[in-house]
């Protein structure tokens, strides 16, 4: 399975969209997990609503939000207020009973804000406009990269 690389700026939001066959995955919840090492388990971060018909509702765990458009076949994960510690390998998963099928592997890279490397002494930013919450701007570039990470469940 190819790994998609997404880059986001520290402090901003990064949106990940995983597409799937809506009929094949009918009735299945989706999850976003973080892979622990190249061959380690995938640790659940957040999953969609327990009632599949309500999967369109946003579910949050900390700064990570997930929502599933089950008709279109797109699950969207938003990593808000991106931090350096958020960098790493993740998976979008489709859950069926006790099985987890990998829909997509995503490598998240966090870029430091160039302003952090300068003396921003006289720069003033209003507090309410520094968050980018709700804008969900995909401040990222993406590319495909072949990796040898095995699928995990």
């Amino acid at each position: 399975l190819n790994t998609t690389v997404l880059q986001g700026m520290a402090g901003q939001s990064l949106r990940v969209s995983c597409t799937y066959d809506a009929l094949k995955h009918w009735g299945r919840r989706k999850a976003w997990c973080r892979q622990l090492g190249e061959e380690g388990p995938c640790q659940r971060v957040v999953s969609t609503h327990g009632v599949w018909l309500l999967a369109f509702l946003k579910k949050r765990n900390g700064s990570t939000v997930i929502a599933d458009d089950t008709l279109a076949g797109t699950v969207t994960i938003t990593l808000k207020n991106l931090q350096a510690g958020d960098a790493g390998l993740y998976q979008c998963q489709s859950l069926r009973g006790r099985e987890a099928e990998v829909l997509q592997k995503v490598l998240v890279e966090v870029l430091e804000d160039p302003l952090d490397d300068q003396d921003a002494g006289d720069l003033w930013v209003p507090e309410e406009s520094s968050s980018f919450e709700g804008a969900q701007v995909e401040h990222s570039t993406s590319r495909n990269q072949e990796t040898s990470f095995p699928p995990t469940s």
């Epitope: 066959d21 009929l23 094949k24 009918w26 009735g27 599949w52 018909l53 009973g97 006790r98 099985e99």
Partner: antibody
Framework: EVQLVQSGAEVKKPGESLKISCKGS????????IGWVRQMPGKGLEWMGI????????RYSPSFQGQVTISADKSISTAYLQWSSLKASDTAMYYC???????????????WGQGTTVTVSS | EIVMTQSPGTLSLSPGERATLSCRAS???????LAWYQQKPGQAPRLLIY???SRATGIPDRFSGSGSGTDFTLTISRLEPEDFAVYYC?????????FGGGTKVEIK
């Protein structure tokens, strides 16, 4: 009417190859998983594997992995079970069945074929 | 793999009696992924119950399913002559989607 129609009975010799079929009709064949189940004479049901005809995603039981091949041709709404080299112990009734689903769960195998008898004898 | 164990192997009852069939899983199974089937001699199996307790289309209400975790039960409230058959449980919670060994309900 939703139905699965299987190919006819087969009599084969050990070492021969065989491909049996299961044709679906009355529903969207590509959007339901199709499973295969073995029943040896006088015995219970054994789950062999399952295929999603839409993209040919296939799962096997470890007991049957490498022993049989499950495939599908969505253009003619047909799933297949094949052997490259039959053994006497493959003598059994083989059923195909549709795996249904509902919102948030699974319907089990809700439509079954009539079964195909395979006899392997020298 | 999850091993499904059915008991008793054979149940000898008379028409009109209540039949209680047990199915035990070697590890916990989500009730959404537990089904029961009926098979008569010379016929393909027929789905009776899915999701542990939901009756399949056309199945009479004398058939009911219950249970959760590792213990599941199929109950036939009043046996009709056509109910004498072999019954199988199956889990499709985790591949391979194993069947139980079956319970034969025979006429006493």
């Amino acid at each position: 009417e939703v139905q699965l129609v299987q190919s006819g009975a087969e009599v084969k010799k050990p070492g021969e190859s065989l491909k049996i079929s299961c044709k679906g009709s009355g529903y969207s064949f590509t959007t339901y998983w199709i499973g295969w189940v073995r029943q040896m004479p006088g015995k219970g049901l054994e789950w062999m594997g399952i295929i999603y005809p839409g993209d040919s995603d296939t799962r096997y039981s470890p007991s049957f992995q490498g022993q049989v091949t499950i495939s599908a041709d969505k253009s003619i709404s047909t799933a297949y079970l094949q052997w490259s080299s039959l053994k006497a112990s493959d003598t059994a009734m083989y059923y195909c069945a549709r795996a249904g689903h509902y919102d948030g769960g699974h319907l089990g195998m809700d439509v079954w074929g009539q079964g195909t008898t395979v006899t392997v004898s020298s | 793999e999850i091993v499904m164990t059915q008991s008793p192997g054979t149940l000898s009852l008379s028409p009109g009696e209540r039949a209680t069939l047990s199915c035990r899983a070697s590890q916990s199974v989500s009730s959404s992924y537990l089904a029961w089937y009926q098979q008569k001699p010379g016929q393909a199996p027929r789905l009776l119950i899915y999701g542990a307790s939901s009756r399949a289309t056309g199945i009479p209400d004398r058939f009911s399913g219950s249970g959760s975790g590792t213990d599941f039960t199929l109950t036939i409230s009043r046996l009709e002559p056509e109910d004498f058959a072999v019954y199988y449980c199956q889990q499709d919670d985790r591949s391979p989607y194993t069947f139980g060994g079956g319970t034969k309900v025979e006429i006493k």
